[in-house]
Structures are given as structure tokens and as C-alpha cells.
């Protein structure tokens, strides 16, 4: 099937035949990613993504992390990673455990960003940052 760069239904081409993402979303491994230019708190970011039929990104493979870091324009972006203080462990918003390293940890930094460094960075949930949303490609 022919793949179009632009289409009238608000979807853009992807790197996979027959699979599309909405306009302004990036395709990677059967998922669509939206990197916002506006900023908000983590809570507002979660709601922002939910309003787009998506969730904050779950960056649970090195490949996915590299893909996103390559397109983040040296800005900080909230992702779907939160520190559960009572348990003292980081979890993705689907509740699965994150066993990797988070830098810049601080008792008031219970959310996480990517983009400015090559690592996951702890951040205040109340500070406004850009956000990365993720959903299934159609």
C-alpha cells in the first residue's frame, strides 16, 4: 500500500506499512509518541496525555529511551515514572517496577524527566516541564 507524507484525516506516515500515528506524533515500534512544546506539572501532564487518548510515556527499554532522547531537543520532558515513597521504589504509571537508576534524587523529587541528559532524572512533580505522551499506533 502507498504511504503518504500528509493526509487529510489528520494522520501521518510511519515507518511501518499500514500503521499510522496522528499528525505531529512520532512512530516507533508500533507506538505513537507526542512531544509537547508547552509545559505543565506532572499531574497536569498526565491529564493532558489522557485527553489525547494516551498516557505519559513508559520508557522501559534502552532502545525506546535512545529513540526519545534523539528527538527531545535538549529539553526536559515528564515521563510516566513516579517514586512511591512508602515503598521506596520507582514505578511506571502502569505500576510495574523500574529497576534502573534515577539521577538527581531528592526527597521532594517524586517524578522523573528525560531529555536534558542521557539518564532518567528525578524532578519535582509541581515544576512545569514538557511531556511525552504515548499510545498504540493504529
Amino acid at each position: 500500500p502507498q504511504i503518504f507524507n500528509k493526509s487529510n484525516d489528520g494522520f501521518t506516515t510511519t515507518r511501518s506499512y499500514g500503521t499510522v500515528c496522528p499528525k505531529d506524533w512520532e512512530f516507533y515500534q508500533a507506538r505513537c509518541f507526542f512531544l509537547s512544546t508547552s509545559e505543565s506539572s506532572w499531574n497536569e501532564s498526565r491529564d493532558f496525555c489522557k485527553g489525547k487518548g494516551s498516557t505519559l510515556a513508559i520508557v522501559n527499554t534502552p532502545e525506546k529511551l535512545k529513540f526519545l532522547q534523539d528527538i527531545t531537543d535538549a529539553e526536559k520532558y515528564f515521563i510516566g515514572l513516579i517514586y512511591h515513597r512508602e515503598e521506596k521504589r520507582w514505578r511506571w504509571i502502569n505500576n510495574s517496577v523500574f529497576n534502573g537508576n534515577v539521577t538527581n534524587q531528592n526527597q521532594n523529587f517524586n517524578c522523573a524527566t528525560i531529555g536534558l541528559t542521557k539518564t532518567f532524572d528525578a524532578a519535582s512533580c509541581d515544576i512545569s516541564y514538557r511531556r511525552i505522551c504515548e499510545k498504540n499506533a493504529k
Epitope: 506532572w42 499531574n43 512511591h84 515513597r85 512508602e86 514505578r91 504509571i93 502502569n94 510495574s96
Partner: antibody, heavy 124, light 111 residues
Amino acid sequence: QSLEESGGGLVKPEGSLTLTCKASGFTLSSYYYMCWVRQAPGKGLEWIACIYAGSSGTTVYASWAKGRFTISKTSSTTVTLQMTSLTAADTATYLCARKLGDVGYGHTTYFNLWGPGTLVTVSS
Amino acid sequence: ALVMTQTPSSVSAAVGGTVTIKCQASQNIYSTLAWYQQKPGQPPKLLMFDASDLASGVPSRFKGSGSGTEYTLTISDLEPADAATYFCQTYYDSGSDDLNAFGGGTEVVVK
């Protein structure tokens, strides 16, 4: 730390009932979500709803429970479950349970503390 | 909706023996699985979380394993006190309302 439920009993079909869960040994603070789970006689466990114990009071319901069940935090140590339009299928032991949460952003994990339950019987 | 299928519904073993209980999820739940023990007339008690982490005070005879959609609870060196019904539960959040799905339970009889 413990939980204790009260308010169960016999209720007629289409009737209403409010159950109360009282926490002892801890306060309903920002680390916890308080939930209700039910268990029909001789059957398995069925989750009903949870409420975030922190200031936001975020609630989440099982899809089948929306509309008929309302979970509320009524004090620093109590949570209630209001049930309406009850039918025989709602006959069960209703258990209060605590879940660990994050910092109030709507994500909870496993149930790490349970109450003994209160029996609700719906019959004419 | 996310469905947890637990097998068998009942299992019997002798004191000192081993029993294995399986829990299958209808989709990948990324190890967001807990196991509970419930004795007659008592509330459930947390045994295991994140598929393989023992809850506080639970003996190491209880072992959880698995990933993806398949999970197992193994109880070795069975004791009479292990006679109970065991439930699995997922706390995977896929963004839908139907969280906290439980398995149907497995009754363990210790002979």
C-alpha cells in the same frame, strides 16, 4: 495497625446501606489509598472502589460499581461506602483494605492491610 | 477487561510436600502481581508482591515467579498452617477502569 468495618446487616432489595471502615494505629495520610473489596459466600474477591487518603481525595471505581456505590473519606481515620439499589447479587462480606500509593497521582499497588469484613445480606 | 485465570481450583498435598499454583493474565501485566492467603473466617493476608517479592514476615518457603502473562506461587515444605485459599491479584494499570483483577482462588488442602 488494623482496619475494622461496620454497618453490615440485612437489607431489603432496592434498599440502601452505608458501611464504615475505621483505621487504628495509623492515619489516612498521603501514602495510602483506602479501598472496598467484597466476597460473596464461598466465592472469590471482587474489587469495588478506592479513595486516595491524601488531600486530593481521588476516587476510582470498578466499572460495574459506578453509580450505585460511593466511596468517601469522612475523617482522618474513617472511610465509608454508600450502596444503593441493592439486589440479592450484592449479598457478600464487604472488606475494607489499604493499598500503598504514590504521592497522590492516582496509582496504587497491592493491598497490604485488610479488615475482617462486615456481612451484607440483601433479602426480602 | 483484564482477566486473571487461576489453576487449579483445589490442590492437595502431604505435610512436607510442595504445591504449585498458577495464575494466567489475559495480557502482559509486567510482574504487577500479588498473592494472598485467606483462611476461613479471616481476611486475606498479603504474601507476595511484584510477582516475587516476599511480604514482611512471610517465610521463604513461599516463592513467587513468572513474567509476562504467566505467574506461579510455589509452597514448599508444606505445613498444616498452610491450608487456606490462595488468590492472585494484578495491580497493572492499563488506563481502563477495571483495575485490581483477582484470580478465582485455589484451595490448598494439607494432608
